[in-house]
Amino acid sequence: KESCDVQLYIKRQSEHSILAGDPFELECPVKYCANRPHVTWCKLNGTTCVKLEDRQTSWKEEKNISFFILHFEPVLPNDNGSYRCSANFQSNLIESHSTTLYVTDVKSASERPSKDEMASRPWLLYR
């Protein structure tokens, strides 16, 4: 029997390489049974996760899963960092794994570094 708890399926240690100036959609896959939970996004600042209040979000519904989407239109250099989605369900707070955005500022990066290079050398993002 499948659990009817809300589950947030952001992959553990997931990472995205994106360009400043481009649009980007960050998806939080949400599984629920009856009532869709209230889901929010936050950005990690040290050990605290700062709620993103005034950001454009939307829902995309698919057959077996829904996606709560955080829109970046466009991506800005300071969007670099780690994000988490969380859901309120039956008075419980369910938190996803964090997902990390590596933003390359095309104006300052003459040659786009590789994804693996950005993961291991984050200072490249701020050259």
């Epitope: 399926y9 992959k11 553990r12 240690q13 990472e15 995205h16 390489s17 994804k115 993961a119």
Partner: antibody, heavy 120, light 112 residues
């Protein structure tokens, strides 16, 4: 059921490029991570790297990073490994493995492995 | 890199004896999510590794309950309470907490 199957040339010349494919069935690769692991004859296991097929993001073993490229093709549900400038030390059994998702994130399914010999 | 050191490198036991394999990591494997991604694999000759234990102590389905895992932080143990002939294999610990992922060097279990 979940299956992974490695394929590619069994013999590669020194200084050449090793190219392998991991064909996956019974699951959607974009929901998981795909890893490559190798095992030289009579030795232990060495992690090569992994890819997130959902977006192509890779992580590599620093000892191999300058020579390795892992890629994926969601439409074919497969991942690939390329290792350049090979030497005899790259002779090994190469495995691809799936990292299962929420909530365990471990290598729960492996291919049978393919033996690659580097020799002229 | 996280170094995973297993001990002993090999052990030879009689049927029914207890096997203990240790794995020590050079850094804590406790992840930010509060879980410890330490796994044990069994590899028999000519076969790929098979997952036995994940998250330190959770037994994979189909794995006999004579196998168990324990530990925390940097010190972990795989125990086989009563060794059987089919347990002859090489056992590897693996950490999935930090990049790069790393394996222990392996412990070979033989029957006396």
């Amino acid at each position: 059921q979940v299956q992974l199957q490695e394929s590619g040339p069994g013999l590669v010349k020194p200084s050449g490029t090793l190219s392998l494919t991991c064909a996956d069935s019974g699951f959607n690769i974009k929901d998981t991570y795909i890893h490559w692991v190798r095992q030289p004859p009579g030795k232990g296991l060495e992690w090569i790297g992994r890819i997130d097929p959902a977006n192509g993001f890779t992580r590599y073993n620093p000892s191999l990073k300058s020579r390795v490229t892992i890629s994926s093709d969601k439409s074919k549900n497969q991942a690939s490994l390329k290792l350049s400038s090979v030497t005899a030390a790259d002779t090994a059994v190469y495995y691809c493995a799936r990292e299962d998702g929420y909530p365990y994130y471990t290598l729960d399914a492996w291919g049978q492995g393919t033996t690659v010999t580097v020799s002229s | 890199d996280i170094v995973m050191t297993q001990s002993p490198d090999s052990l030879a036991l009689s049927l029914g004896e207890r096997a203990t394999i240790n794995c020590k990591s050079s850094q804590s494997l406790l992840d930010v999510d509060g879980k410890t991604y330490l796994n044990w694999f069994q590899q028999k000759p000519g076969q790929p590794p098979k997952r036995l234990i994940y998250l330190v102590s959770k037994l994979d389905s189909g794995v006999p309950d004579r196998f168990s895992g324990s530990g925390s932080g940097t010190d972990f143990t795989l125990t086989i309470s009563s060794v059987q002939a089919e347990d002859v294999a090489v056992y590897y610990c693996w950490q999935g907490t930090h990049f790069p992922r790393t394996f222990g060097q392996g412990t070979k279990l033989e029957i006396k």
